[in-house]
């Protein structure tokens, strides 16, 4: 069965500043991955980022740097100030559309005890299966 | 499919200046990164330079000081401004696009032939 998997990291040198990184774990080949926070997109999420392997990516701020790290993962660094600006309760998610397995979603946010700098282990999400 | 246009190329003397553009069909996303390539006659093609969508960029030794990549306000836009030209950078110019940055998908314009001569 396909997993997704979300970490969620604040940098230490800038507070405002987050990486959010999802890999997908299955053998499909994907197609596209869209990013959002607030919540899963298309329920009341907002995107932050899409990703086509093909085509290219688009991103919307706070987003600063959406990229490939792998054919099956990838980073986003957000950064913003006032009301930009994540906050440490901010749920990030991931969903990837992949080909056989179907669309896959994950959501994750910072670990409540991390200090600036710190990250859980990206271990898989609560798996939300989009169709 | 991404479509790449290159135009500017031409013949120009030592010394002089030319500058290349290349337009991308893509619109809507970014392309992770573009770059520019060249190949002389005889010539296996090689990297010029590169910059990334946030504006990294990448040149080669042999143009450093030269030449400048940059990408313009349209979405996509490419530009190779090069100056002091030599000889030996006769070739063609090419536009190259992989839109994700891991050579998953990889797109090339047809080319536009430079000549430095006198």
């Known amino acids: 069965t396909p997993e997704v998997w979300v970490q969620v990291r604040m940098e230490a040198t800038e507070l405002s500043s987050f990486t959010i990184r999802c890999g997908f774990l299955g053998s499909g080949s994907i197609s596209l991955v869209t990013v959002s926070w607030g919540g899963p997109n298309g329920a009341g999420g907002t995107t932050l980022a899409v990703l086509h392997p093909e085509r290219g990516i688009r991103q919307w701020a706070p987003a600063r740097q959406a990229r490939w790290e792998t054919q099956s993962s990838i980073s986003l660094i957000l950064e913003g100030s006032g009301a930009s600006s994540p906050c440490a309760n901010t749920t990030f998610c991931c969903k990837f559309a992949s080909f056989p397995e179907g669309s896959w979603e994950a959501c994750g946010s910072l670990p409540p005890s991390s200090d600036p700098g710190l990250s859980a282990p990206p271990t898989p999400a609560p798996i939300l299966r989009a169709d | 499919e991404v479509q790449l246009v290159e135009s500017g190329g031409g013949l120009v003397q030592p010394g002089g200046s030319l500058r290349l553009s290349c337009a991308a069909s893509?619109?809507?996303?970014?392309?992770?990164?573009m770059g520019w390539y060249r190949q002389a006659p005889g010539k296996d093609r090689e990297l010029v330079a590169t910059i990334t969508y946030t504006g990294s960029i990448k040149i080669v030794d042999s143009v450093k000081g030269r030449f400048t990549i940059s990408r313009g306000d349209a979405k996509n836009s490419l530009y190779l401004q090069m100056n002091s030209l030599r000889a030996e950078d006769t070739a063609v110019y090419y536009c190259?696009?992989?839109?994700?940055?891991?050579?998953?998908?990889?797109?090339w314009g047809q080319g536009t032939m430079v000549t430095v001569s006198s």
């Open positions: 893509e619109t809507y996303f970014d392309l992770y990164v």
């Open positions: 190259n696009a992989d839109p994700s940055g891991l050579g998953r998908k990889v797109y």
